[in-house]
């Protein structure tokens, strides 16, 4: 759920890493209310996820490793 470029709340679903092509991080500031990881899926969707959740951290770590290898 996002308002323009800001995530307003987190998904209540768990996504598989195979579904995700990349991510961006949203930091809470004067523009956006919450910290979030925005996953970009193979279907072109942007999914707002809670950066504190284990499954989110795992995917971010996996994607970051991939990026660092390139």
């Amino acid at each position: 759920a996002s308002n323009f470029d800001c995530c307003l709340r987190y998904t209540d679903r768990i996504l598989h890493p195979k579904f995700i092509v990349g991510f961006t991080q949203q930091l809470a500031n004067e523009t956006c209310d919450i910290n979030a990881v925005i996953f970009h899926t193979k279907k072109g969707l942007s999914v707002c996820a809670n950066p504190k959740q284990t499954w989110v951290k795992l995917i971010v770590r996996r994607l970051s490793k991939k990026i660092n290898k390139m």
């Epitope: 768990i14 996504l15 598989h16 195979k18 579904f19 504190k52 959740q53 284990t54």
Partner: antibody, heavy 120, light 107 residues
């Protein structure tokens, strides 16, 4: 070795609640998810929901929201599922199963299942 | 939710034969598919994960293939011990959904 121990059976009255347990051993409890799966007699498998024991994060199949509540006690490495307002539709075998994101999010170990019978 | 459709619902084959079970998803699940084997009176067991990877302790007579929306499980040189119900499962996104199952019997 990895083991998930579940009580064999529960007999409960319609309208009542039941809380079933799943005691994990042989691995670090907080490093793996715990899923719950329902199987009615002669029918297929239905995913109820999952809990992450490291932070108690849960997500449910919409169909079971309000019916099932998943919790954990990390001190005893035990997962629990409470089912409320029971009807005959809830008579089934309920499995706890370890979710392993290291092997493609698969459920790699299963408990023996708790058979729940709802009857007056 | 992603729907999983398995076929056939049941099949009977002779010892030594090769059988194939198929599983179709209602949308692309990008290989996020697992197979389970459930023998009579027992709990399900992980058989194949990630569409193609054999789970620890399972016979190499089992193999998984497929991509996109279509997947299959092949059992070669059928053994009497293979009598079971086989389920596919989508793990792309919750809620995780199972196929209806394929009951395998020996002729």
């Amino acid at each position: 070795q990895v083991q998930l121990q579940q009580p064999g059976a529960e007999l409960v009255k319609p309208g009542a609640s039941v809380k079933m347990s799943c005691k994990a051993s042989g691995y670090t409890f907080t490093n793996y998810w715990m899923h719950w799966v329902k199987q009615r007699p002669g029918q297929g498998l239905e995913w109820i929901g999952v809990i992450d024991p490291s932070d108690s994060y849960t997500t449910y199949n919409q169909k079971f929201k309000g019916k099932a509540t998943l919790t954990v006690d990390t001190s005893s490495s035990t997962a629990y599922m409470q089912l409320s307002s029971l009807t005959s539709e809830d008579s089934a075998v309920y499995y706890c199963t370890r979710g392993n994101y290291g092997v493609d999010y698969a459920m790699d170990y299963w408990g023996q299942g708790t058979s729940v019978t709802v009857s007056s | 939710d992603i729907q999983m459709t398995q076929s056939p619902a049941s099949l009977s084959a002779s010892v030594g034969e090769t059988v194939t079970i198929t599983c179709g998803a209602s949308e692309n699940i990008y290989g996020a598919l697992n197979w389970y084997q459930r023998k009579q009176g027992k709990s399900p067991q992980l058989l194949i994960y990630g569409a193609t990877n054999l789970a620890d302790g399972m016979s190499s007579r089992f193999s998984g293939s497929g991509s996109g929306r279509q997947y299959s499980l092949k059992i070669s040189s059928l053994h009497p011990d293979d009598v079971a119900t086989y389920y596919c499962q989508n793990v792309l996104i919750t809620p995780y959904t199972f196929g209806g199952g394929t009951k395998l019997e020996i002729k």
